[in-house]
Amino acid sequence: SERCDDWGLDTMRQIQVFEDEPARIKCPLFEHFLKFNYSTAHSAGLTLIWYWTRQDRDLEEPINFRLPENRISKEKDVLWFRPTLLNDTGNYTCMLRNTTYCSKVAFPLEVVQKDSCFNSPMKLPVHKLYIEYGIQRITCPNVDGYFPSSVKPTITWYMGCYKIQNFNNVIPEGMNLSFLIALISNNGNYTCVVTYPENGRTFHLTRTLTVKVVGSPKNAVPPVIHSPNDHVVYEKEPGEELLIPCTVYFSFLMDSRNEVWWTIDGKKPDDITIDVTINESISHSRTEDETRTQILSIKKVTSEDLKRSYVCHARSAKGEVAKAAKVKQKVPAPRYTVEGGGGTGGLNDIFEAQKIEWHEGGGHHHHHHHHHH
């Protein structure tokens, strides 16, 4: 056959549909690959052809559009299953062509099974709700185009195995599920089952999404630097290892980029010659507030290093903050000679020095202050 622009297998579109439910799948050519839509193509005399390769087979075969009750049909740029079967799983190709033009793309379709509590291998979209923020809604997703507006479907909402009824703060309202005041206990998977009639048959659409309750913008604050702080002095002798943690708390903010970085004498560590390493760890609270810790480490600190300025910086959509660490060189204890009595004795003057120990565990960081005499 003549050459065809083959866009290959579009694995970005991992389409998953439930067994024994209707599915409408648009040809991806018009959505992602071509600059024109189906109507334009059709007007220009182009024909859309569908075929498929079964799971674990190499043979491309035409789609059978003559199945009982038109189980599989094509309408404009949409391939319809009414309903799907488990063995419909495979790679589907839509090809747009006429005598002079040809373009095609394949995409994987996976028909998945669900249990009575709607558990399945389906990848679930996540919807974030703000904690204690007032009424918020989620909407039953991806049900447009399955039935005309004249058809009034019945919608039942579930949380796991259980129909949502008589819940304290969650109210089903048709295609919407309203959360009067979202709490941590509202975290979980919510399923809407849309039931509608078509040509004397009843079809069900099942859609599950994950609700995650996150920190409210009402409570959001600029980054808070817990360490370094004014209470801790990093006092070291040359040759010792210098470890300075920068621990920053970030309120949850939708789509905010949280950043933590160190500067040494006003420069980024990459831009200076000293041998410094930075290790970062991140932990999250139940409402997705974030604690980032960056530990600045100099294995063998020099007296020059101990004179430098070490500043921790943090930035989020709420603002930018910075805090300098108190670093100083440990003064060696002078030795005094005491004469008299039965001979000589050494007396060390007592200086109080602070050593910092860094302990990581369970997302909590502790400073231990030891006084060495």
Epitope: D115, I164, Q165, N169, S185
Partner: antibody, heavy 122, light 107 residues
Framework: QVQLVQSGAEVKKPGSSVKVSCKAS????????IQWVRQAPGQGLEWMGY????????DYAQKFQGRVTITADESTSTAYMELSSLRSEDTAVYYC???????????????WGQGTLVTVSS | EIVMTQSPATLSVSPGERATLSCRAS??????LAWYQQKPGQAPRLLIY???TRATGIPARFSGSGSGTEFTLTISSLQSEDFAVYYC?????????FGQGTKVEIK
Amino acid sequence: QVQLVQSGAEVKKPGSSVKVSCKASGSPAEPYAIQWVRQAPGQGLEWMGYIIPSLGGYDYAQKFQGRVTITADESTSTAYMELSSLRSEDTAVYYCARGQTLYESGRQFDIWGQGTLVTVSS
Amino acid sequence: EIVMTQSPATLSVSPGERATLSCRASQSVSSNLAWYQQKPGQAPRLLIYGASTRATGIPARFSGSGSGTEFTLTISSLQSEDFAVYYCQQYNNWPWTFGQGTKVEIK
């Protein structure tokens, strides 16, 4: 280790009400449902209803609608089943049962209480 | 509601023998079926869910099979502690319903 401990046996007069408690220990942080099931002497198991203590959701079997009330006190991890207008045929052992989460299909009756015998007699 | 029918009502088996219990649903329940064991004076205990998955701590001599409307619980070699009443339960449709039970007794 999750356990369910139920209140003691009760003897009730016809027409009165009974309230059976079910205290959960070692409860997980995730929401879960408490089921109530009864078993008349020498008979099979009959599902009565459930409650989700942390969310308030509940439902009852059609047969018991209007006579049963299932409640929960989250602060004490205790669920209650109250059955009113008692008659002799309500004489049964009443069980509470639960799963670990709301999501595990087939494991919603994973853990059972020891049962509470309610005798209805004049 | 879905009616679950168990057969036989009583099964007399000698220790060491195989026991086969049946459960039929009045309409398809897919694989959404559980089996419970109940000994006198005790609460029921979950044995099998998803028609064939053994619950935690259940010995391998217990196995479940079937889907749709016909289900079977098999105890490959009966031990003395297995003599009890066995219930099937569907959780495909609300209300969740139990069978009337099969008593497995010593022959």
